[in-house]
């Protein structure tokens, strides 16, 4: 006997209670593929979530985060509170980046300043909580009469960069 359910298109389900008739998905549910025996419940965007795309009979709702929050996880499964630039979100809330680290975004963690000396360069602009250091030419490049063929100065030990 042919399975009549395979003929049911997306947006419907195969109703076994009605001799395998294709019935439309009930309100607030959907089926994104044909041949489904049930429809899935639509995702609800509530609390810190807001609706980016309404649920239809053939596709689930899609959520974004409300202002002041950003998405985490696949399909925005979580919303995380923003912090200010120069901060990171910890177990105790938004905290300023420690000295020597920075965060130029409203999300994520504070990252260490670039150690210019590891590349044989000098610090052109000091780092802040919000911005990384800007590395400039190597000290040797700045000496009078230096040519472009001058090899880079030997890298100093980490922790001794002029920051």
């Amino acid at each position: 006997l042919q399975d009549l359910c395979s003929n049911c298109p997306a947006g419907t389900f195969c109703d076994n209670n009605r001799s395998q008739i294709c019935s439309p998905c009930p309100p607030n549910s959907f089926s994104s593929a044909g041949g489904q025996r049930t429809c899935d419940i639509c995702r609800q965007c509530k609390g810190v979530f807001k609706t980016r795309k309404e649920c239809s009979s053939t596709s689930n709702a899609e959520c974004d985060c409300i202002s002041g929050y950003h998405c985490l996880g696949a399909e925005c499964s979580m919303c995380e509170q923003d912090c200010k630039q120069g901060q990171e979100l910890t177990k105790k809330g938004c905290k300023d980046c420690c000295f020597g680290t920075f965060n130029d975004q409203k999300r994520g963690i504070c990252r260490p300043w670039t150690n210019c000396s590891l590349d044989g360069k000098s610090v052109l602009v000091n780092g802040t909580k919000e911005r990384d250091v800007v590395c400039g030419p190597s000290p040797a490049d700045l000496s009078p009469g230096a040519s472009s063929a001058t090899p880079p100065a030997p890298a100093r030990e980490p922790g001794h960069s002029p920051q």
Epitope: R43, K46, G47, V48, F49, C63, Y69, L72, G73, C76, S77, M78, C79, E80, Q81, L89, T90, K91, K92, G93, C94
Partner: nanobody, 122 residues
Framework: EVQLLESGGGLVQPGGSLRLSCAAS????????MSWARQAPGKGLEWVSG???????YYTESVKDRFTISRDNSKNTVYLQMNSLKPEDTAVYYC????????????????WGQGTLVTVSS
Amino acid sequence: EVQLLESGGGLVQPGGSLRLSCAASGFTFSSSAMSWARQAPGKGLEWVSGIYSGGSTYYTESVKDRFTISRDNSKNTVYLQMNSLKPEDTAVYYCATWGTLRFGVWAEYDHWGQGTLVTVSS
């Protein structure tokens, strides 16, 4: 069906106190972390406080030492005791489940109450 029903809001003078309650039903309350959030007029939603199933508590900096979150598993209720209230505490306060256990983070499976209004004014 999961339900969260907040109560206890109202008008209070600066320096005064209020205790908010959130009665929960439709899920295993005793093993669920719970949280409070608030939304001041014209502002965004702010994470206020959270409590793990084991009782560990967390607060946002602005309410620390003034607000206390607690729970009574026998009554399926979470509380927010608010002391030394300030005009800037005026907001709609929401109770929510807190499945992520992470400060300032909620997941799509978390449930939310309808909120209760707290007004701090002289």
